[in-house]
Interface confidence: low
Amino acid sequence: DSSKWVFEHPETLYAWEGACVWIPCTYRALDGDLESFILFHNPEYNKNTSKFDGTRLYESTKDGKVPSEQKRVQFLGDKNKNCTLSIHPVHLNDSGQLGLRMESKTEKWMERIHLNVSERPFPPHIQLPPEIQESQEVTLTCLLNFSCYGYPIQLQWLLEGVPMRQAAVTSTSLTIKSVFTRSELKFSPQWSHHGKIVTCQLQDADGKFLSNDTVQLNVKHTPKLEIKVTPSDAIVREGDSVTMTCEVSSSNPEYTTVSWLKDGTSLKKQNTFTLNLREVTKDQSGKYCCQVSNDVGPGRSEEVFLQVQYAPEPSTVQILHSPAVEGSQVEFLCMSLANPLPTNYTWYHNGKEMQGRTEEKVHIPKILPWHAGTYSCVAENILGTGQRGPGAELDVQYPPKKVTTV
């Protein structure tokens, strides 16, 4: 009853000329131990002789005969469980069907295993996740349907022809279910890896090239932008014009929308790659950037700090402190919005210019009654002189003087 024989092994094994084949195999013959084993190459049943014809690669009988010329073939099994085989080296003409002719005391069985031997080392296969996004860790897998104890190999990862620094984990399987060598590489791609070539290279133990597989990375990423401004230093005067240009240096997938932001807030009706600011005012000073979006999300350029220069505005005076007690100290501060900052100040006391006072602050260490009155100032920068503001009143408190009795 032939159904008593149960085998487990890979359906097809792959190798190349000069390498080797390790065939993991288990069996169960329910009626007793194995008495005879013959390994055929492309066996064919001969009805006349009721026997199998074909090249005998290996023969092990009760007499213990082994074909002397087939030392490269080894039966590594036993009489009741293991039918593992090794062919080393394996040759191109070994391709085809291997037939394991098993005989016990009362039963016979022919088990067939496919062997595919190529002329040259066949390439591994790179497996990528369905989508790769920038900065998200992915696992790249390189799979080769080959592994053999007598022929060590290695899989190396290359990016644009340069070995990748990330540590790869290589695993091998030589089981009755599958035979393979696999290398897995954890990798966090950046947007700049988009379009780059990744290679998995099969090498022998000495690092000699055998074959490879390549893929082009498709890294989804937000748009990468460059902002250019005219004038390049982004410093202008009120009334001048400014042009900012947004350039997309990379986007995957394609970009869909463009917008401009000032101090983090979107500018209305500005959705082209060029931002034209005509006759700028000081209120338009601030940080500008462009934002371009695609299906992954928005990308932002670096910020450009636009400085609109203008002459000083009408100045105000702050007094620390009024009213002041005679003999105390007082400080006056001239405040005026200007860009660039004022470089010169003119101070006035009761409308009359205070000679020698050109600083932002005026300090009077000892206040006297005659210091009371209105203080005002004028600020000046390279663009002009501001207007004198309303000024501030200093009140000086002092004890009675020259008391006379009436």
């Epitope: 988009h194 379009g195 997309v248 990379s250 986007s251 394609e254 970009y255």
Partner: nanobody, 121 residues
């Protein structure tokens, strides 16, 4: 060998129309973002228009918006630039470019040789 071959350029009057074509070979056309650029004498090469791998979205430089339209036919491995209301300032050599990345900058993987467009007033 990758080839991008432009055609359709010529000498026209201001206000006329022209249609430029670019035929690609040696690349998987549908995998590339296709663009048109132009370069006027003594000036830098500038982005004119670009179109996504599937034919959308398309992008046009501000200077040609409303006048020029880019389109592509993946079955023919071709990209087109329909140019209407041509102005003398549109005079330039027009280049077709194939880019793996969608980008408006003058960086491309493959360039055509260019076709001359001259607009007289």
């Amino acid at each position: 060998q990758v080839q991008l071959v432009e055609s359709g350029g010529g000498l026209v009057q201001a206000g006329d129309s022209l249609k430029l074509s670019c035929l690609a070979s040696g690349i998987t056309f549908s995998s590339y973002y296709m663009s048109w650029f132009r370069q006027a004498p003594g000036k830098e090469r500038e982005f004119v228009a670009g179109v996504g791998r599937s034919g959308a979205p398309s992008h046009h430089a501000d200077s040609v918006k409303g006048r020029f339209t880019i389109s592509r036919d993946n079955a023919k491995s071709a990209v087109y630039l329909q140019m209407n209301s041509l102005q003398p300032e549109d005079t330039a050599v027009y280049f077709c470019a194939a880019k793996w990345m969608a980008a408006s900058t003058t960086v491309a993987d493959y360039w055509g040789q260019g076709t001359q467009v001259t607009v007289s007033s």
